[in-house]
Interface confidence: low
Amino acid sequence: MSLLSVPHTESVSLSTGSTVTIEARPLVCFFNEPHLQVDFHTEMKEDSDIAFHFQVYFGNRVVMNSREYRTWKEEVESKNMPFQDGQEFELRILVLEDKYQVMVNGQAYYNFNHRIPVSSVKMVQVWRDISLTKFNVSN
């Protein structure tokens, strides 16, 4: 199976009903504290505002946030940890009318209310300590 290079960034146009699908595997065991980060940017630049920041501290916690005018806002944390050490996972981010809903291996685990209009999202970046096998956006 061919791997996508990481960081992986793609131009996107999102609206209610869009789904971002990611298939990946942690690069190292959880003892070594790997991370996964997914950022929904409002511009085609890494330092742009982030409508949705999703970061997994594998084996520990998940943090969600937004970055507006270069300032991080109030963090939303979850201790739900459906990711398994060394196991491939499927992450689906659903764009709902009022929030992003994040599913792991087909089950909904995380919700993040919209703070920045979904229509302003122009780029998604997936990065950190993962091997990435699939990235897909469906509208």
């Epitope: 996508l4 290079s5 960081p7 992986h8 960034t9 793609e10 131009s11 085609m44 630049k45 970046q125």
Partner: nanobody, 121 residues
Framework: QVQLVESGGGLVQAGGSLRLSCAAS????????MAWFRQAPGKEREFVAA???????TYADSVKGRFTISRDNAKNTVTLQMNSLKPEDTAAYHC???????????????WGQGTQVTVSS
Amino acid sequence: QVQLVESGGGLVQAGGSLRLSCAASGRTFSTYSMAWFRQAPGKEREFVAAITRSGGNTYADSVKGRFTISRDNAKNTVTLQMNSLKPEDTAAYHCAAGGTYSFVPRSYNYWGQGTQVTVSS
């Protein structure tokens, strides 16, 4: 290994056109996404345009509607047609090749030396 060589830069008046070309060596050209970035003196490298392996493309807002990126996998070339040039388009233009379709310079493994574009008012 891919080597990239840009050409087509030069001095042009505002409102004029230039066509930049990037020639790639190696038989794996068609497996790479390609992009153009530019860098003006004292400024960061800036994304201009990118094209996927299959020809899908995207542009920086500042050049949208004026620049067109295209590729010819048979000839191992990617071109950037630049119309309605403005003085703020003045920069060194670099061609890049990488395994992912990206706006982020570090996503690209291979870079050309660049070709200078100067737009006078």
